[in-house]
């Protein structure tokens, strides 16, 4: 029961984490204009991994994609790669873990196979979480490095944009979402790995007991089975709840009345 709960909780935590990683990757607010000197600004800039946006005091928001690959900083490309790898690994991990869930019975799948799948998905979640945390941390480090380097007509920042003396960038909401989401995915992965230990059949040292029946001699050996061997198929009629988890990823940076791209 505890194993099922740990596995289920690990799956749910990882699912939330991966949804968060996807949300963070799509969000436009990876870096936001530093408002330390001017808390009320008529023009507010913020940038994501894929586009940069400007929200005017009028309420209009204009976002422009980075329509170049070669012109983008290598660090930004690296962050993109880390986040995408994190999402892909997480998605595969989720798919594997659905079939590994103890509460879901698919055909005559053995518990040892479920244990292996649980371990696999757990490792995938851990790597996915680490990728997200690494990506966000690299971007944060890049922001800290560039923070004091924003001077007039210097080509720095996302996509080689001109930085005027007034504009400096600080941590955006996406960074915090990414850190939390990466952490959750990592925790979920660890929980799956812990659950895997409980799912795997342990080798017992019981002595073989022989039962003599008339005409037949059948020996049952309760112990001595390897983890990869199954205990036999489940003949009970169990309902399979295979509801696909739907993630609604609707990210809007800073509510605005007029968004146009």
């Amino acid at each position: 029961m505890a194993v099922t709960a740990c596995q289920g909780l690990g799956f749910v935590v990882s699912l939330i984490g991966i949804a968060g990683i996807i949300a963070a990757t799509c969000m436009d607010q990876w870096s936001t204009q530093d408002l330390y000197n001017n808390p009320v600004t008529a023009v507010f800039n913020y940038q994501g991994l894929w586009r940069s946006c400007v929200r005017e005091s009028s309420g209009f928001t204009e976002c422009r994609g980075y329509f170049t690959l070669l012109g983008l900083p290598a660090m930004l490309q690296a962050v993109r790669a880390l986040m995408i790898v994190g999402i892909v690994l997480g998605a595969i991990g989720l798919l594997v873990s659905i079939f590994a869930l103890k509460c879901i019975r698919i055909g005559s799948m053995e518990d040892s196979a479920k244990a292996n799948m649980t371990l696999t998905s757990g490792i995938m979640f851990i790597v996915s979480g680490l990728c997200a945390i690494a990506g966000v941390s690299v971007f944060a480090n890049m922001l800290v490095t560039n923070f004091w380097m924003s001077t007039a007509n210097m080509y720095t920042g996302m996509g080689g944009m001109v930085q005027t003396v007034q504009t400096r960038y600080t941590f955006g909401a996406a960074l915090f979402v990414g850190w939390v989401a990466g952490g959750l995915t990592l925790i979920g992965g660890v929980m799956m790995c812990i659950a895997c230990r409980g799912l795997a059949p342990e080798e017992t040292n019981y002595k073989a007991v022989s039962y003599h029946a008339s005409g037949h001699s059948v020996a049952y050996k309760p112990g001595g089975f390897k983890a990869s061997t199954g205990f036999g198929s489940n003949t009970k009629n169990k309902k399979i709840y295979d509801g696909g988890a739907r993630t609604e990823d609707e990210v809007q940076s800073y509510p605005s009345k007029h968004d146009y791209v």
């Epitope: 204009q33 001017n38 009320v40 600004t41 008529a42 023009v43 800039n45 913020y46 940038q47 940069s52 946006c53 400007v54 005017e56 005091s57 009028s58 309420g59 209009f60 204009e62 422009r64 007039a152 920042g157 944009m161 001109v162 930085q163 005027t164 003396v165 007034q166 504009t167 509510p255 009345k257 007029h258």
Partner: antibody, heavy 118, light 113 residues
Framework: QVQLVQSGAEVKKPGASVKVSCKAS????????MNWVRQAPGQGLEWMGN????????SYNQKFKGRVTLTIDKSTSTVYMELSSLRSEDTAVYYC???????????WGQGTTVTVSS | DIVMTQSPDSLAVSLGERATMNCKSS????????????LTWYQQKPGQPPKLLIY???TRKSGVPDRFTGSGSGTDFTLTISSLQAEDVAVYYC?????????FGGGTKVEIK
């Protein structure tokens, strides 16, 4: 068509308050910020503040040191500008103006003349 | 606060001739995020509210005649009327739309010579 209709001229004594209204029509009222600009006789334009009818957020010119208060009435699509502790130098034409792309003011009210005299 | 300085104070130009006025800001009005200059030009005729001509330093508002052209970047901006018409006699104001408080220039009065 877009119209911003302001209330009539006002004559006030120093120290009093004045409340000028600006009724908007012909567009989505909550979709555009409303600004207030004043112009003293023979002088240039001076921005006083703005209000976002959607969220109710305001920004003020600190020159007025809290004397200006902007409010809205969504039900009548009207913006109000109240200026307190009036002085003779507050004598001016007060305009409401809708904020557009680039934070520019694309439509203006006809103006309300406020005269402060003892 | 950003200080907007317009020059000249007044300008007398013959009908059909080019009228050029300048606006200088104390800080750059160029926004790094979209590489747009947050400067606006208005025309005000006596007894009337100002009328928007140009925003983002060079984008003409729909309905504004193409003889009005805005140019410049950073701190120096220019409004040019390529061929002055009688109805262009007015005071022209530039405005900082980049940073609060939004500030206006003192205006340039355009007259017919």
């Amino acid at each position: 068509q877009v119209q911003l209709v302001q209330s009539g001229a006002e004559v006030k004594k120093p120290g009093a308050s004045v409340k000028v209204s600006c009724k908007a029509s012909g567009y989505s009222f909550t979709g555009y910020n409303m600004n207030w600009v004043r112009q003293a006789p023979g002088q240039g334009l001076e921005w006083m503040g703005n209000i976002d009818p959607y969220y109710g957020g305001t920004s003020y010119n600190q020159k007025f040191k809290g004397r200006v208060t902007l409010t809205i009435d969504k039900s009548t699509s009207t913006v109000y500008m109240e200026l307190s502790s009036l002085r003779s130098e507050d004598t001016a034409v007060y305009y409401c103006a809708r904020m557009y792309h680039g934070n520019a003011f694309d439509y203006w009210g006809q103006g309300t003349t406020v005269t402060v005299s003892s | 606060d950003i200080v907007m300085t317009q020059s000249p104070d007044s300008l007398a130009v013959s009908l059909g001739e080019r009228a050029t006025m300048n606006c200088k800001s104390s800080q750059s009005l160029l926004n790094s995020g979209n590489l747009k200059n947050y400067l606006t030009w208005y025309q005000q005729k006596p007894g009337q509210p100002p009328k928007l001509l140009i925003y983002w330093a060079s984008t003409r508002k729909s309905g504004v005649p193409d003889r009005f052209t805005g140019s410049g970047s950073g701190t120096d901006f220019t409004l040019t009327i390529s061929s002055l018409q009688a109805e262009d006699v007015a005071v022209y104001y530039c405005q900082n739309d980049y940073s609060y408080p939004l500030t206006f220039g003192g205006g340039t009065k355009v007259e017919i010579k």
